[in-house]
């Protein structure tokens, strides 16, 4: 059955199946792929979203997997294992028993190994740098207007507390958004910076996860802000452990 038939929908995650079978006939939604119940009042975790994405028909996937040696996330196109809270399990393995450790945003942080590989803890990504290049415009955007609009966007659309948007830098045509969130800073109910960054990334690519959205319509004082390139860098609380072979490749 579909969400539409059940008169029930999840605004924050279109990759769900919903029905009014919660307490008192309330809408209850489950993520595709995992079948886990999701809270539609906030963002769904990146792990559950990736799992749902991998469960979609193959022809629905339009992005190409980047090189294995990329220094940024390869768009996370693997079928992850998520814990009961929807977070990434520290160790991920594929169908051929190749395993690796990931950080809290699901990005590989060790060399690949076999089933004997140990990942003792899920290492937190505490600093995310979103690096954007916008398409040419008649003139540069006003920095304070741009800063205000991006902070509004992360607060209102991605539900990220303003204190976690550390800075917005601008040198035309490059925009950098810094998100910072230590384990000690993140309170119960706070949106994770990794989830906010992933929703933003998908919005920028025109693949919005929100119900009823095609992509991101972003304007600064009425002037459209069109992004032509995005790179996202992740910094973990504990540095990653790659072999020298990888580092010199």
């Amino acid at each position: 059955h579909t969400a539409a038939q059940d008169n029930c929908t999840c605004p924050t995650n279109k990759m769900t199946v919903c029905s009014p079978d919660g307490p008192g006939g309330r809408c209850q939604c489950r993520a595709l792929g995992s079948g886990m119940a999701v809270d539609c009042s906030t963002l769904t975790s990146k792990c559950l979203l990736l799992k749902a994405r991998m469960s979609a028909p193959k022809n629905a996937r339009t992005l190409v997997r980047p090189s294995e040696h990329a220094l940024v996330d390869n768009d996370g196109l693997y079928d992850p294992d998520c814990d009961p809270e929807g977070r990434f399990k520290a160790r991920q393995c594929n169908q051929t028993s190749v395993c690796w450790c990931v950080n809290s945003v699901g990005v590989r942080r060790t060399d690949k190994g076999d089933l004997s590989l140990r990942c003792d803890e899920l290492v937190r990504t505490h600093h995310i740098l979103i690096d954007l290049r916008h398409r040419p415009t008649a003139g540069a955007f006003n920095h304070s207007d741009l800063d205000a609009e991006l902070r509004r966007l992360f607060r209102e659309r991605y539900r990220l507390h303003p204190k976690f948007v550390a800075a917005v830098h601008y040198e035309q045509p490059t925009i950098q958004i810094e998100l910072r969130q230590n384990t000690s800073q993140k309170a119960a109910g706070d949106v994770d910076i990794g989830d906010a960054a992933y929703y933003f990334e998908r919005d920028i690519k025109g693949e919005s996860l929100f119900q009823g959205r095609g992509g991101l319509d972003l304007r600064v004082r009425g002037e459209p802000l069109q992004v032509e390139r995005t790179l996202i860098y992740y910094l973990d609380e504990i540095p990653p452990k790659f072999s020298m072979k990888r580092l010199t490749a």
Partner: nanobody, 126 residues
């Protein structure tokens, strides 16, 4: 597809009251941020009020503050705009809109709202 329907508009004298309703044809509006907008003849559509999905916080335009009240009833799948002490300048077509936002404010652009109703006419005249 979420379809919004406004009702409760009509003709009222200055100083009178109206209660507008916004319903979503069977859908729950519980996790949606809802905004009320209005468009007077020959003017641009402007934001009147909104209620956030995350914490039910509200925003009001300066021109209606203290006179209008927005509220929601999730059980009835509706959002309301109680309009008191109506003035001639409140005459407009009133629209409700739903957005997959967590919060709304004075600076929330109209394009952040995903679904719009057809509008209901409010006429304040003596």
């Amino acid at each position: 597809q979420l379809q919004l329907v406004e009702s409760g508009g009509g003709l009222v004298q200055p100083g009178g009251s109206l209660r507008l309703s916004c319903a979503a044809s069977g859908f729950s509006l519980e996790h949606w941020t809802i905004g009320w907008f209005r468009q007077a003849p020959g003017k641009e559509r402007e934001g009147v009020s909104c209620i956030s999905s995350s914490d039910a916080s509200t925003y009001y335009a300066d021109s209606v503050k203290g006179r209008f009240t927005i509220s929601r009833d999730n059980a009835k799948k509706s959002v309301y705009l109680q309009m008191n002490s109506l003035k001639l300048e409140d005459t407009a077509v009133y629209y409700c809109a739903a957005g997959s936002l967590g919060y709304c404010s004075r600076s929330t652009p109209q394009y952040e709202y995903d679904y719009w109703g057809q509008g209901t006419q409010v006429t304040v005249s003596s």
